[in-house]
Structure formats: structure tokens, C-alpha cells
Interface confidence: low
């Protein structure tokens, strides 16, 4: 076959070839930031000629042209300056209102290097209508000037700009315009990840977290799709695998989808994930009808097994078929559950389409979306039950109109995006479900957010460091766990009755500053000297305390609460039914067997997770008996005198050699990690052997080196009494 000519340089830019100079190869131009290539690409035809999509002359000279932002076509009830036909990158436009009108939105906007204006549409409004003046975004023309209930406004874009968002909006009874704000964009424009992540993330986080659907968030983003905590989400991930997607880019599609899956499974909802790859035909790698779709490990495994070569015989982009396979899946599930049942009707559906190009075979994907809307009975009342996110990747062949047509349109939200490359996509998925950015109403316990450049406290955001300074007696170091915005749970033995609040230092999130203490609340049954007369020098029963802080903690990536047993938060974290009892939680977290758990220890100023097994089955007795080897307990006749029912036991060499706690670990949480969440089941209290002499952990420890922890299920009445104003406990 002939090869295509090589005289295709672009003035001021560069180009890449997907398959060299051979027929079928896609030549992609790129330019420095602030410039865009014209044309964007050429395709090597089988005739050995370059074809330029949409061009009349096939080999017009490729050039890098300056990016420009669209000018306002009309601005009501005010003036804007300067008045230009279009604006250069870095150029500003300023807005002022006439008397009697108030400016809403951004008074000054700047043209960004991606051809998009920063800020928000400026509107001069006098508040006269039932709905606020919807404004006219830059580059748009609006018809319709009445803003009463039921009134409609229509938008179109000037010249060669592309409209994204709703071309028609209606003023609804609740004073909110239907659909989403229309934006006129240059065909070559794209979105920055830092804009997409919050837009996607806010929508998703509310779906996952459980805010009131009518409640306004701080960012005033209005209605956000949401899953009732008892509800169910079907998430459908559609990954483009057509010829124009390189193998490396497909890997990043997979990685991004994995990130999404990993995050979504750690929220408090029941979720099923479908994975579909597509080119000329779709391939369903995981269906929501498969029980494994509810299992994060299985879903990620099916993603990892997705093979780029699965579609090598069919290289087109059949978005219709991909969406139709979602429709067929929904149809099967509806027939299985029954169309009229709550089980079917209460499922929310979110589709994420990752594509690098426009659909080029199989008919209009909009038809499949219409079928999906029909089967889900999507109307104004059920609008929350479907969200379609259409994400185009690569500025090359992505069709804004098609993405906009496929993406959902909801007030204050965006569902269609174009990103510059797969790196940007990866970054969006990395940041879109950042728990620290979620609103205060979504206070998820036991949640962590891992970062490569993150600190130890990103991985253990509940961990608190406690230090008690005793003049002339040195100081005591302990750990604790943040359990609410005002309370840290720790061990009572870290303190004496003589310790004053000002001598107790608590820090969280790895911060250097110490928190002010209001009071330390001891369990009333704790008495270290309670059995001195019986020859037991130290008695650690009920060794728990709560530190009440003077000021409310500000939750963020490095400061978050751990989950406590028998709270509603833990029911949701474990995705158990809302009717779950305290006893059922106990059976879930502390079954009568060896239970994998962890504690957090500080080694050489680094926090490290240590995996241990709670001996709660046949090894429990031997674990507890080893308490006789503890200093001062060798004379105890009946070991239950010191190991009361309040204790959990770890350590020893079976089923595995457990690491041991050190002195400074006291008061820290003993944690069960389940369903991507962290639930505290114990408080580290005391150990049989000090394996940490000279601050160094000894490598070899005896088999009887056991550790004892206060079982939180055994001190629940006290926890509930002290924390009932800040946590919702189940009936005990």
C-alpha cells in the first residue's frame, strides 16, 4: 500500500502519527499553550493521500493560530468593556449594571488559554421575575425575556461557536430554571482538569453521601443527584477502545475507571458497577446483573483484564451500541426485579462515557439515551434517577455537539466535558471524590484518601498524638482517635488524676499546633489501683477516656473521624441495612474467630499500619492466659482477675506472627478495615512484653508477647452517654 507524503509540518507546532506514514494512520497536530492547530488532524487514506476532516482543500497548510475567547453578543441592562469581536488569551472583559439592577456573577472575566472564560456569567438582575434572570453567556443569543412560572427562553450561539448545555430552559415552579446553563465555546476549546474535577465531584459526592436533595450546598450548586443511604446505585463505565485510542491511553482509561471504582466503593451506598469496552461493537466485561458487580475486587479485576486487543478487528466508534448494551442490561434487570417493584424503581443509574471521538457508526447514540430515559421513566419527578456523564478526551475528533446531546442537563451542573488528554482525565478521577472537599453534611467516618505525596495523616486521618507533660517526671506519650469534631478517644491510663488540662497536649493531622483541652472524661469504673490489695499492682479494666476539645476540629484530608461500633455511621460504612442492630454489627465486626485488624504505630517519626489478628475464637483462651507473663501478674492465680471480659487479645505467632504495640501506642485505636472503611473496635491498653526497649522494636519476640485492648462493644453505654449529642448510636 502506498504511504502518505511527509510534507505535513505545522508552522510553530508539532505533530504525531498513530501508525507512521501508512494508510489508516492519524496525524495529530499540537501547538504551544494559547495556540490551537488548524487543521487539528489529517487521516492517511488507502490511496496514499492525506484527508483533512471537514476541509474543502485537503492539503491546506497547517498552522498554529492564537486561541481567542468569544465576545458577548448582547448584555442586558448594563455595559461591558472593552468591546471587541473576540478576546485574546489573558484579555479581560468587565461588566457594569445600570441603576436599579444588581450584578450577579463575575464583574471581570479573563480569557484562559483553553479558549474558555474564567468566572461565571455576569447578569444584571432586578429580581422581578419568578425565576432569576438566566443571563446570556458570552457568545450566545437569547430569545425570551419573560421569567415567570412556565416561561421559556431559547439560546443559540453566534458564528461558528458550539453550544453546550441546554438550548431551551423553562422557569419551574420552584423558581429554578430547568436544564443547565448554555455556554458557547470555540470548537477547539477544552476543559482544564481543575474545573472538571469539582464539577463532576460535587455531583457525584452528593449522590454518594446523602444530603437532602433540596438542600443548597455551600457552593450553591443546587440540586445534586443523591442516593438515599438505603438506596442503590448502578454505575455503568463505558470505555472507548477504538483505533484512535492508543494502547497507552486505553490503559489510562482503565486506571481512571479503577480510581473511580475504588473511591465509589468506600462511600455509604450499595453500588453495582458495569464495565463495557467498545469500538465497532461493545464488550460487557461486568454486568450489574452479576453479583460480582457489587464486589470492588471483582470489578477492578475485570477492569484489569480488559484487553486493548479485544477490539482489534473492529476499530470504529459505535457509541450507540455501547449505550444500547446499557439499555439491554437495564431491561433485563427490570424484568428480573419487576417493573412495578420498589427494588427496581429506587435504583439510581449513572453512566460515565469515556471516549476520544465522535460516534462514526451504528446510528445516533442519542436514540439509545432516549430508550434509557424511557425505560427508567425519567421525567421531572424522576430526574434524579439518571445521570449521564459524557467525557471526551483529546481535542482532536471529539464532537462537542454529540457529547452535549448525550450528557444530562441539570440546573447548576455540567455533565459534558472535553479534556486535553488522558493525563488530564486521570487527574480528574484522582480528585473528583476528594472527601475533604465534600460538604459538612457528608461527614463520613473511617474514610481515607491516599496520595503519593500525601502524609501519614492522609492514610490515618483519625490518628491523634497525645503528650502529657509532668514537671520533674518527664512526659507520657500516647495515641488516640478522633471520633467527632470535639472528641478524641484514648486510654485512661495515659493520665493521672493530678494531670491538669493545660499539661495535656493533643495534636491531629500531623499539625504542630496543640489543641486546647476542655476536659478529660474517664470511664467511671476505671481504677488502676483497684486490685492493689489483691496483689495486682496495675489493673486496666475499663481503660478508656474521652478528651473533650475546647474548639471544633475542622475536618479535611488529614483530619477525619474513625467509625465507632453501634453507630448509624458504621451501619452505613459497612453498607448494612438501616434496620441493623448493635448485636448484628458486633457479629459483623467481631465474629468468634481470628479477626484481621490493625493498629497504627509511630516508628522513627513515621506512622505505620501494623496488621494483627484479634484472637476471638479457639485461640482466645491461650492468648488471655499469656497475661501471666506480664510483669507483676506472675502471682495471679486466676487470669480472669486481670483479663476481664472488657479486653480483646492480639499478639503471638498464630495464625501469623503479630507485631506488638509499644508504650507510645497506648490509647490508639484497634481497627477493623472492612469495605474500604475503618472501624475502631478497641483501645490499645497494655502488653505482656515490652518489645520496644531503647525505642527500637526487637526483631525476635517471644510467642507469649500479647497485647490487650479495651473492647469498645463492652463500654458502649458510657460512650453513648458521652457522645449521644454528636453521634447517632443504635439502641444498645
Amino acid at each position: 500500500a502506498p504511504s502518505c507524503p511527509q510534507n505535513v509540518n505545522i508552522s510553530g507546532g508539532t505533530f504525531t502519527l498513530s501508525h507512521g506514514w501508512a494508510p489508516g494512520s492519524l496525524l495529530t497536530y499540537s501547538c504551544p499553550q494559547g495556540l490551537y492547530p488548524s487543521p487539528a488532524s489529517r487521516l492517511c487514506k488507502s490511496s496514499g493521500q492525506w484527508q483533512t476532516p471537514g476541509a474543502t482543500r485537503s492539503l491546506s497548510k497547517a498552522v498554529c493560530k492564537p486561541v481567542r475567547c468569544p465576545a458577548p453578543v448582547s448584555f442586558e441592562n448594563g455595559i461591558y468593556t472593552p468591546r471587541l469581536g473576540s478576546y485574546p488569551v489573558g484579555g479581560n472583559v468587565s461588566f457594569e449594571c445600570e441603576d436599579g439592577f444588581i450584578l450577579r456573577g463575575s464583574p471581570v472575566r479573563q480569557c484562559r488559554p483553553n479558549g474558555m472564560w474564567d468566572g461565571e456569567t455576569a447578569v444584571c438582575d432586578n429580581g422581578a421575575g419568578h425565576c432569576p434572570n438566566p443571563g446570556i453567556s458570552l457568545g450566545a443569543v437569547r430569545t425570551g425575556f419573560r421569567f415567570g412560572h412556565g416561561d421559556k427562553v431559547r439560546y443559540r450561539c453566534s458564528s461558528n461557536l458550539v453550544l453546550t448545555g441546554s438550548s431551551e430552559r423553562e422557569c419551574q415552579g420552584n423558581g429554578v430554571w430547568s436544564g443547565t446553563e448554555p455556554i458557547c465555546r470555540q470548537p477547539y476549546s477544552y476543559d482544564f482538569p481543575e474545573d472538571v474535577a469539582p464539577a463532576l465531584g460535587t455531583s457525584f459526592s452528593h449522590m454518594l453521601g446523602a444530603t437532602n436533595p433540596t438542600q443548597k450546598t455551600k457552593e450553591s450548586l443546587g440540586r445534586k443527584i443523591q442516593i438515599q443511604r438505603s438506596g442503590h446505585l448502578n454505575l455503568y463505565l463505558l470505555l472507548d477502545c477504538s483505533q484512535s485510542v492508543s494502547e497507552n491511553d486505553f490503559l489510562i482509561f482503565k486506571e481512571s475507571a479503577s480510581l473511580m471504582v475504588d473511591r465509589i466503593f468506600s462511600f455509604e451506598i450499595n453500588v453495582s458497577v458495569a464495565i463495557i469496552t467498545f469500538a465497532s461493537e461493545p464488550k460487557v466485561l461486568m454486568s450489574v446483573l452479576n453479583d460480582n458487580s457489587r464486589d470492588m475486587t471483582e470489578v477492578i479485576s475485570s477492569l484489569e483484564n480488559a484487553n486493548y486487543k479485544d477490539h482489534e478487528n473492529g476499530t470504529g466508534t459505535n457509541t450507540y451500541a455501547a449505550l444500547n448494551s446499557v439499555y439491554l442490561m437495564m431491561n433485563n434487570q427490570m424484568r428480573l426485579l419487576g417493573m412495578e417493584t420498589m427494588a427496581w424503581q429506587e435504583i439510581r443509574h449513572a453512566i460515565i462515557l469515556l471516549t476520544d471521538g465522535k460516534s462514526n457508526m451504528g446510528g445516533s447514540p442519542k436514540t439509545a439515551v432516549d430508550h434509557i430515559r424511557e425505560i427508567l421513566n425519567i421525567n421531572q419527578k424522576r430526574n434524579d434517577y439518571l445521570d449521564i456523564y459524557a467525557i471526551g478526551v483529546g481535542k482532536l475528533d471529539v464532537d462537542w455537539r454529540e457529547l452535549n446531546e448525550l450528557g444530562s442537563k441539570k440546573d447548576g451542573e455540567r455533565h459534558a466535558f472535553i479534556l486535553q488528554d488522558t493525563k488530564a482525565l486521570h487527574q480528574v478521577f484522582e480528585h473528583m471524590l476528594d472527601v475533604s472537599k465534600l460538604t459538612d453534611t457528608i461527614c463520613l467516618c473511617g474514610m481515607v484518601w491516599e496520595h503519593r505525596k500525601g502524609t501519614d495523616y492522609h492514610k490515618q486521618p483519625w490518628q491523634a498524638k497525645i503528650s502529657v507533660i509532668r514537671p520533674s517526671k518527664g512526659h507520657e506519650s500516647c495515641m488516640g482517635a478522633v471520633v467527632s469534631e470535639y472528641f478524641v478517644l484514648t486510654a485512661a491510663h495515659c493520665f493521672t488524676v493530678d494531670d491538669k488540662e493545660h499539661s495535656i497536649k493533643v495534636s491531629v493531622g500531623g499539625e504542630k499546633r496543640d489543641l486546647e483541652i476542655e476536659v478529660v472524661l474517664f470511664h467511671p469504673n476505671y481504677n488502676i489501683n483497684g486490685k492493689k490489695e489483691a496483689g495486682i499492682p496495675e489493673f486496666y479494666d475499663y481503660d478508656v477516656a474521652l478528651i473533650k476539645l475546647k474548639n471544633k476540629l475542622k475536618y479535611g484530608q488529614t483530619i477525619r473521624p474513625i467509625c465507632l461500633p453501634c453507630t448509624e455511621g458504621t451501619t452505613r460504612a459497612l453498607r448494612l441495612p438501616p434496620t441493623t442492630t448493635c448485636q448484628q454489627q458486633k457479629e459483623e465486626l467481631l465474629p468468634a474467630q481470628d479477626i484481621k485488624a490493625l493498629f497504627v504505630s509511630e516508628e522513627e517519626k513515621k506512622l505505620t499500619r501494623k496488621e494483627v489478628y484479634i484472637k476471638n475464637g479457639d485461640k482466645k483462651g491461650s492468648c488471655e492466659r499469656d497475661a501471666q507473663y506480664a510483669p507483676g501478674y506472675d502471682k495471679v492465680k486466676d487470669i480472669s482477675e486481670v483479663v476481664t471480659p472488657r479486653f480483646l487479645c492480639t499478639g503471638g505467632v498464630s495464625p501469623y506472627a503479630d507485631p506488638n504495640t509499644c508504650r507510645g501506642d497506648s490509647g490508639g485505636p484497634l481497627i477493623v478495615h472492612k469495605r474500604s472503611r475503618f472501624i475502631q473496635v478497641g483501645v490499645i491498653s497494655w502488653g505482656v512484653v515490652d518489645v520496644c526497649k531503647n525505642q527500637k522494636r526487637q526483631k525476635q519476640v517471644p510467642a507469649h508477647a500479647r497485647d490487650f485492648h479495651i473492647n469498645l462493644f463492652q463500654v458502649l453505654p458510657w460512650l453513648k452517654e458521652k457522645l449521644q449529642d454528636v453521634l447517632n448510636f443504635l439502641p444498645l
Epitope: P193, E194, D421, T455, D456, G510
Partner: antibody
Amino acid sequence: EVQLVQSGAEVKKPGASVKVSCKASGYTFTDYNMDWVRQATGQGLEWIGDINPNYESTGYNQKFKGRATMTVNKSISTAYMELSSLRSEDTAVYYCAREDDHDAFAYWGQGTLVTVSS
Amino acid sequence: DNVLTQSPDSLAVSLGERATISCRASKSVRTSGYNYMHWYQQKPGQPPKLLIYLASNLKSGVPDRFSGSGSGTDFTLTISSLQAEDAATYYCQHSRELPYTFGQGTKLEIK
């Protein structure tokens, strides 16, 4: 004024280890990552790894993982880079470099020549 | 790893003339709206010196005859009017992700 002062030249035998120090002054030591870069005579620059002095978290070039160890002593504002199992091809000038807010190497030590020879 | 390839390996330019050095990355170094590409100058016996950060930002104290441009994978360092003290080796370096890598260097001589 920001200054990074490195320890003196070293001559080592193959198989031995070397530990290069880098004392920082003129800024808050824990505020910026410290990186280590090496340069063989007449050759280009090669990134070894970085350390966050505040949290002591490290990132390594895979090529040096297992052989290079980066540590800090916050109390004396000093970063260390130890390279073990030395070979003749490890003969190079080793630089410490402080990252700025943009992850660029804004300040460099004067370099430490490490010669590995039997 | 992201491989950075500089071109040319060496060049000779007359005093007062314009010098241009290119750096191509095997993967895009752009993220968060910034290009994590930096340029350094190194003279014999001295450590490198930062000239340009984030592709196009001049480090304070560096003469404004130095400029940087580019985005994604292709970057350029330009010296608008070469001075005698500009004879050195120039390196590009990315910090988009680990591991950070350098270009192989371009030796600039006065013609």
C-alpha cells in the same frame, strides 16, 4: 539567603557505602522537598529521589531503589543520601537540590565528588 | 519513565544571535493547567542554575533574554541575543510525576 552546603569528597572501594550530607540554611528546612541528583564526569544529570523533610516521606528513581536511602535530621536542618553496594559507575558528583513551590530545583549544593575505585 | 530528548546535542551561535534549544517529552508534562517543565544552565565545575520554571516563567535574577515556551510534550528555550557568558550546557527537566527526569543536555558554544 538560601544555602546548601554539602560534605567533602569521598573515595570508596567497590561494594562499600557512602553517605553524603547536605546542610540547609536560610529557610525553614521542613517547608520544601530536598532532592538528590548525580552527574558522572562529562555526562548529564540523573535524578536519584526526593524526601519531604516534614513527613520524611520519600520518592525514589526505581534505578536506585534498594541502594539509595534518603534521610533527614530536622534538628540540624540536614539531609543525607546514602548509596550502598558502590560500583565504579557510581563515580560522580552528587548534588542536593531544594525544590521550590513549582517542583523545580531552585537551589543547589556545591556538589560532592564520590570516587569508586579499587 | 518520561524520556526527555533535547535537540540539538550541541550548537554554535554567534554573539548577539538567537539560540534555540528544543526538548521533547515522551509523555505530556501538563497537569492542573501548568506544564511541569523547567530549564537549567550549567557551566563547568558548577552546579546547575534554574533559568525557567513551569515552561515559560523566568526565575527572578535571570536576564530577560532567556525565555521558554511550549506545552504538553514540546518545549523550547530561547536566548534572544547571545552573550559570551551564555556559553554553557542547558538541560530541560520535568516534575510532572515520579521519577523526575532530565534531558541529555545541549552544549551551547560561541561561534
